[in-house]
């Protein structure tokens, strides 16, 4: 090899590098070195390129024409096909032709951002150039066509098309099977349909922050499989519905911050099983409802910092047990950490939990239960005045708590504080001073002597009539009342909550007196009330009184409202034969749902229930009686139960049975002169008619024959010998007839006959 | 770091009166309690009272009452006892002390105070 | 006035030894209960605070307690704990203080 060429006079070298950037050149340089691997030209006034100096540059890959005044993509000349990058950032060009890139055989990465280009046609990227990154970042695009960058299915893995002018995009709009990046930010995209980037199979980032996406259609991520982080920031959904995430298997983020979602619904997040962190900060979440992200069971990382929420239900966050991060930052959920227990149950591995700024004046004994697991938790930003005995005490791992509130009412009830926070090494982060009493004001928490703890008084008020839980009969008006005292002249405000949420138009009066004991005391009562109650009212009512000093919440007292049981079907008399099934319709409403029971004449122990053929339906509100039987008849009484009353109905069950004999009718010999008498006991329903016959006809009645009644019984006396034959008795009613004999023997008188034996 | 200075050993006649100062430094002055503790030759150590700087407020304790006043200058970031009418009894170390939790954390060097006829 | 009583007045222990002082309180002092080491012509010295928080002291020093009755524990005595050990209750004023535990090595 010869001695090395030397630099290009107007250029700067280093290694294989040739900088020639911000020399203000309007042409190439004419003495470019052959051994350039790497060429500056970036930051001049070249606004076009002669190829022909691009000659002799066997060895160049990567070329910077950045920041220059080209209006089209140059040609290098020869060295086209070696060229691995091309940067062409901030020039002026308007558009790309297929054409100019074809000589680019080894291309891979070129930028065309920040330039004037207006649309992408099919036409600009032909097969050929194996680009693997594409920036169009930063131009006037608004049109992309149908397969645009279908030249590049084999090789492209990033697109970059953020900030451009992008309205829509097509169903399929990129058949790019082998694309991990797509960037798509800062555009003007209103809608995303379905099916809109199939064709992605490789995507891993989506980006589509600060756009106008007012609606995901369902399926609209269908197809991208392999995607783990999907930016939506920035945009106006107002909803995350389930079948928008379909197909989102391997989704591991998802950035929904600073959209106007109102509602995070239940189902949908099924879709992202892999879901590891959920960002919905800055919405307009008002409330958290139960097991609301319960298919979520990977989410690690939860921010919901800069909602609005006031509402979290107990359960809300039932099913996260791998979350570790919950930021509820700069929310309204005082109320969730004053009084409730259990809104965060289910968070077994939670180790961070941040609620600065959330306006809570105090904390609940049970607020944080469910967190025993807690290292990390941040109330800084809260104006806390109390804390109650050992809120904090079952974090057994809590490494770090940030307090910063110069409210603190320093009473009896906060001289656990300081000696729990120093013998648990977590006064770093705390900074706490008394507000009340006035000679304390200022003082750190730390330093007040632990007998100025002292309870004088009672500045924050002190429930003494709770709600009671009530029943009441639909369209009725009932009241629920709640008073308390405090030793304060503060002002004081009055608050329903129902279902934990507060009630914003509320019938409430409110009454204040000085106490009967002690003249100091003040005694606030309010009365809640409720008009015409319906279902609608059912729930737990609780007030909240406030003053300056803190909240006070009452017990929760339960409303049920009751409608008394009436029939929507009752059962009707029923005629049926034996051995077939019974079937009684019986249906009620009422609120609460009344209990249906069955009883026969007045007892549950009756023949169906006891032997088992007793079956009651109850969607269909039928009762049956199967193989049905003669006991089985009688009234039966459905009754319809609630909290409210019981009412009854009842109807009668008759049997009908072929008529039978009970007992055998049995041949007989008698002696003349005898009496002898025939049964015909026969059972049947209706009960049967008895019909004698001798042979084939009638019976004709002589003095000597008498019946029963109800001819079950035929009694011959002084038999005679004419009355021998067959008698036949024959049982009649409306199911059939039945027919027994009994063949009568008639002997002459007693007496010896010639073989010695005694005759009758 | 926190230090506390107190002022050098005094000898007085019994009747008379003594004033020995505390200076605070590596904290907030205002911000903290002080306390005076004494501890008189094979005696049990013996609280006289503390004061709040920030706002002034002291505590005496019933038995030195109307013959101990504690001060503070927090310009100077100091704190004053003096201990009039005295007796021999009140032969003693005295310590200014800061408080943290009911426990002295930090302690000045002491002042002896000798009643002597 | 709370009454703190120290047992024992002294003790001499051997090196290595486990020390324990107890100290009572007249009444229920909330673990507001303070230890001391004072050497001759020496400052006391805050071992424990609030019954079991260690201040800046060796571990082998560790306090228990709670109501009336509380102790000082010296897991391994060394030397250099030749002091004099006083007990301080810090719930109520008058702040009073036990008549001390004189320890030695034997």
């Known amino acids: 090899a010869g001695p090395r060429a030397p630099c290009a006079a107007a250029c700067t070298c280093a290694g294989d590098s040739l900088d020639c950037g911000g020399r203000g050149l309007a042409a190439l340089p004419g003495d470019l070195p052959s051994w350039t691997r790497s060429l500056n030209l970036s930051y001049n006034k070249l606004s076009e390129i002669d190829p022909a100096g691009f000659e002799d540059l066997p060895n160049l890959q990567e070329v910077y024409l950045n920041n220059n005044e080209l209006t089209a993509v140059p040609s290098l000349g020869a060295a086209s096909s070696h060229v691995v990058s091309l940067f062409l950032q901030h020039n002026k060009i308007r558009s790309v032709e297929g054409s100019q890139l074809k000589a680019y055989l080894s291309l891979e990465v070129l930028d065309l951002s920040l330039n004037n280009i207006t649309e992408v046609r099919n036409t600009c990227f032909p097969h050929g150039p194996p680009i693997k990154e594409l920036n169009l970042a930063g131009n006037r695009i608004g049109t992309l066509e149908l397969g645009a960058f279908d030249g590049l299915s084999r090789s492209l893995l990033t697109l970059r098309l953020s900030k451009n002018r992008i309205t829509q995009l097509p169903v399929r709009a990129f058949k790019l099977p082998r694309l991990t990046q797509l960037d798509l930010n800062r555009n003007r995209i209103r809608l995303i349909e379905g099916l809109t980037f199939q064709g992605l199979n490789s995507l891993e980032v989506l980006k589509l922050q600060r756009n106008n996406i007012s609606k995901l259609t369902d399926g609209a991520f269908w197809g991208l499989s392999k995607m783990h982080v999907l930016h939506l920031e920035y945009n106006s959904l107002v909803e995350v519905n389930s079948g928008s995430l379909y197909g989102l298997t391997a989704l591991h983020q998802l950035h929904l911050s600073n959209n106007s979602i109102a509602r995070i619904h239940r189902k949908g997040w099924s879709f992202c099983q892999k879901l590891h962190e959920l960002v919905l900060s800055f919405n307009n979440l008002t409330r958290l409802d139960e097991e609301s992200l319960a298919e979520l069971s990977s989410l690690s990382v939860l921010r919901l910092s800069h909602n609005s929420i006031s509402h979290i239900a107990e359960g809300a966050f039932k099913g996260l047990r791998s979350l570790r991060v919950l930021d509820l930052d700069h929310n309204e959920i005082s109320g969730t950490i004053e009084d409730t227990s259990g809104a965060f149950s289910g968070l077994d591995s939670l180790s961070k939990l941040t609620l600065f700024g959330n306006k809570i004046k105090s904390v609940a004994k049970r607020a944080f239960s469910g967190l025993e697991g807690l290292e990390h938790l941040n109330l800084g930003g809260n104006a806390i005045r109390s804390v109650q005995f050992d809120a904090f005490v079952k974090m057994k791992n809590l490494k770090e708590l940030h307090i910063s509130s110069d409210s603190f009412l320093c009473d009896c009830q906060l001289k656990w504080l300081p000696p729990w926070l120093i013998g648990r090494m977590l006064q770093a982060f705390v900074t706490a001073t008394c507000a009340h009493p006035e000679s304390l004001k200022g003082q750190s928490i730390f330093s007040v002597p632990p007998e100025s703890f002292v309870c004088d008084d009672f500045l924050k008020p002190q429930i003494i009539t709770q709600p009671e839980t009530t029943m009441a009969m639909v369209g009725k008006d009932i009241r629920f009342t709640c008073s308390a005292a405090s030793s304060s002249s503060s002002p004081m405000t009055f608050a329903w909550k129902k279902d934990n949420e507060v009630l914003t138009n509320a019938d409430m009066e409110n009454f204040v007196h000085v106490h009967a004991q002690d003249g100091e005391v003040m005694e606030y009562t309010t009365i809640l009330h409720l008009r015409q109650v319906t279902f609608g009212h059912e729930g737990r009512y609780q007030c909240v009184i406030t003053n300056h000093f803190g909240s006070t919440y009452s017990h929760k007292a339960r409303l049920t409202v009751n409608v008394l049981p009436s029939f929507t079907k009752t059962p009707h008399d029923i005629t049926i034969r034996t051995t077939t099934m019974a079937r009684l319709e019986c249906a009620a409403t009422g609120h609460p749902n009344p209990q249906i029971a069955w009883q026969k004449d007045g007892g549950t122990d009756f023949p169906a229930a006891r032997e088992r053929r007793m079956h009651v339906m109850p969607d269909d509100d039928v009762f049956f009686i199967t193989d049905v039987k003669i006991d089985d008849a009688g009234v039966y009484s459905c009754t319809a139960q609630n909290s409210a009353g019981s009412i009854s109905a009842n109807a009668t069950l008759t049997v009908l049975e072929t008529p039978s004999l009970v007992v055998p009718l049995e041949d007989r010999v008698v002696s003349v002169g005898e009496t002898v008498a025939l049964q015909c006991k026969a059972t049947g329903n209706p009960p049967p008619r008895i019909t004698w016959f001798k042979g084939d006809r009638p019976l004709s009645l002589t003095e000597r024959h008498h019946l029963t009644p109800d001819n079950q019984l035929l009694v011959v006396q002084n038999v005679v010998a004419e009355d021998a034959g067959r008698y036949t008795c024959e049982m009649s009613n409306t199911l059939g007839t039945e027919r027994a004999h009994s063949q009568l023997s008639v002997l002459p008188a007693a007496g010896c006959r010639k073989d010695g034996t005694t005759v009758g | 770091q926190v230090q506390l200075v107190q002022s050098g050993a005094e000898v007085k006649k019994p009747g008379a009166s003594v004033k020995v100062s505390c200076k605070a430094s590596?904290?907030?002055?205002?911000?903290?309690?002080l306390h005076w503790v004494r501890q008189a030759p094979g005696q049990r150590l013996e609280w006289i009272g503390w004061?709040?700087?920030?706002?002034?407020?002291?505590k005496y304790n019933e038995k030195f009452q109307g013959r101990v006043t504690l001060t503070a200058d927090k310009s100077a970031s100091t704190a004053y006892m003096e201990l009039s009418s005295l007796r021999s009894e009140d032969t003693a170390v005295y310590f200014c002390?800061?408080?943290?939790?009911?426990?002295?954390?930090?302690w000045g060097q002491g002042t002896l105070v000798t009643v002597s006829s | 006035d709370i009454q703190m009583t120290q047992s024992p007045s002294s003790l001499s222990a051997s090196v290595g030894n486990r020390v324990t002082i107890t100290c009572r309180a007249s009444?229920?002092?909330?673990?507001?209960l303070s230890w001391y080491q004072q050497k001759p012509g020496k400052v006391p010295k805050l071992l424990i605070y609030?019954?079991s928080i260690h201040s800046g002291v060796p571990s082998r020093f560790s306090g228990s307690g709670s109501g009336t009755d509380y102790s000082l524990t010296i897991s391994s005595l060394q030397p250099e704990d030749v002091a004099t050990y006083f007990c301080?209750?810090?719930?109520?004023?008058?702040?009073?203080f036990g008549q001390g535990t004189k320890v030695e090595i034997k």
């Open positions: 002390a800061r408080e943290e939790l009911g426990g002295f954390a930090y």
């Open positions: 590596g904290y907030t002055f205002t911000s903290y309690y």
């Open positions: 004061i709040y700087p920030g706002n002034v407020n002291t």
């Open positions: 009444q229920d002092i909330s673990n507001y």
């Open positions: 609030y019954t």
């Open positions: 301080q209750q810090g719930n109520t004023l008058p702040r009073t």
